[in-house]
Amino acid sequence: TPEVWVQVRMEATELSSFTIRCGFLGSGSISLVTVSWGGPNGAGGTTLAVLHPERGIRQWAPARQARWETQSSISLILEGSGASSPCANTTFCCKFASFPEGSWEACGSLPPSSDPGLSA
């Protein structure tokens, strides 16, 4: 069964800047990745970025830079200032859509310690 992993890290240089990394562990080819915060996209979450392997990347503030790391993983850097900036307990979710298999999603937040955290 495919799985999604989510890693949230606070940047040491900018304490309110976050990096979210997500990956898809499965055999299908990825058609779309949606990154949201405040919960899953279908349950009150707000979309931060949408990444399509052919048609490019769309992102919305406070997302600063979304990119593909591999064919099945992405990263997203969030701005660390402004009213819409994330806080330490913000939940980030990634949804990977693969055709014709379907979609898989997982959420994660900053771990209690300052070490990078991994949650699936």
Epitope: S29, S31, G42, P100, E101
Partner: antibody, heavy 120, light 107 residues
């Protein structure tokens, strides 16, 4: 303007074969996932087969596995459904449809349909 | 497979009425729900995608809502051209599955 035009339907005896075609125009055919959906007389909609834009990943309804084959010809902008060993229960209007990644794989454009009747 | 159970199966209403059609998934389908309209002898047409987004050219009287397993299609003020059959569909997990349809008839 996006257009999908099916052809190839008709009356066939049980055990016979038909090849349905769907001519696509008005969009970059190679970039979209495509499906065949059928509707038996007076009944609901049923996904029969689907093919990823990479032409590798496919889906088949359990009852048609081993009998139907989905394929496409990018040069001809055409989608096909080869139907062998046809049964009475395959009688339906067959539609080809395009899936939009940005719409959660919703089928945003459909052809007008072609009627397949399997009867002795 | 994920089952999509639509209700009611048929509905009689008058022009100007507010109508609600519901669809219940057998398990969570996130926000991967679409609604289609089909008229007799015609192909289905996409109305709503991602639960609540209207497709190009769809009038604002059509709206969708819900999350998880429970979804609704609402027509705020029925027009004569709205009498048709409506289908919900999930595209969260293969195979994509449809509701059995709701036939909207003139009262």
């Amino acid at each position: 303007e996006v257009q999908l035009v099916e052809s190839g339907g008709g009356l066939v005896k049980p055990g016979g074969s038909l090849r349905l075609s769907c001519a696509a125009s008005g969009f970059t055919f190679s970039s979209y996932h495509m499906s065949w959906v059928r509707q038996a007389p007076g009944k609901g909609l049923e996904l029969v087969s689907a093919i990823n834009s990479n032409d590798i990943n496919t889906y088949y309804l359990d009852t048609v596995k081993g009998r139907f084959t989905i394929s496409r010809d990018i040069a001809k902008n055409s989608l096909y459904l080869q139907m062998n060993s046809l049964r009475a229960e395959d009688t339906a209007v067959y539609y080809c449809a395009r899936h939009e990644d940005y719409y959660g794989f919703a089928m945003d454009y459909w052809g007008q349909g072609t009627l397949v009747t399997v009867s002795s | 497979d994920i089952q999509m159970t639509q209700s009611p199966s048929s509905l009689s209403a008058s022009v100007g009425d507010r109508v609600t059609i519901t669809c219940k998934a057998s398990q969570s389908v996130s926000n991967d729900v679409a609604w289609y309209q089909q008229k007799p002898g015609k192909a289905p047409k996409l109305l709503i995608y991602y639960v609540s987004n209207r497709f190009t050219g769809v009038p604002s009287r059509f709206s969708g809502s819900g999350s998880g397993t429970d979804f609704t299609l609402t027509i705020s003020s029925l027009q004569p051209e709205d009498f048709a059959t409506y289908f919900c569909q999930q595209a969260y997990r293969s195979p994509w599955t449809f509701g059995q349809g709701t036939k909207l008839e003139i009262k």
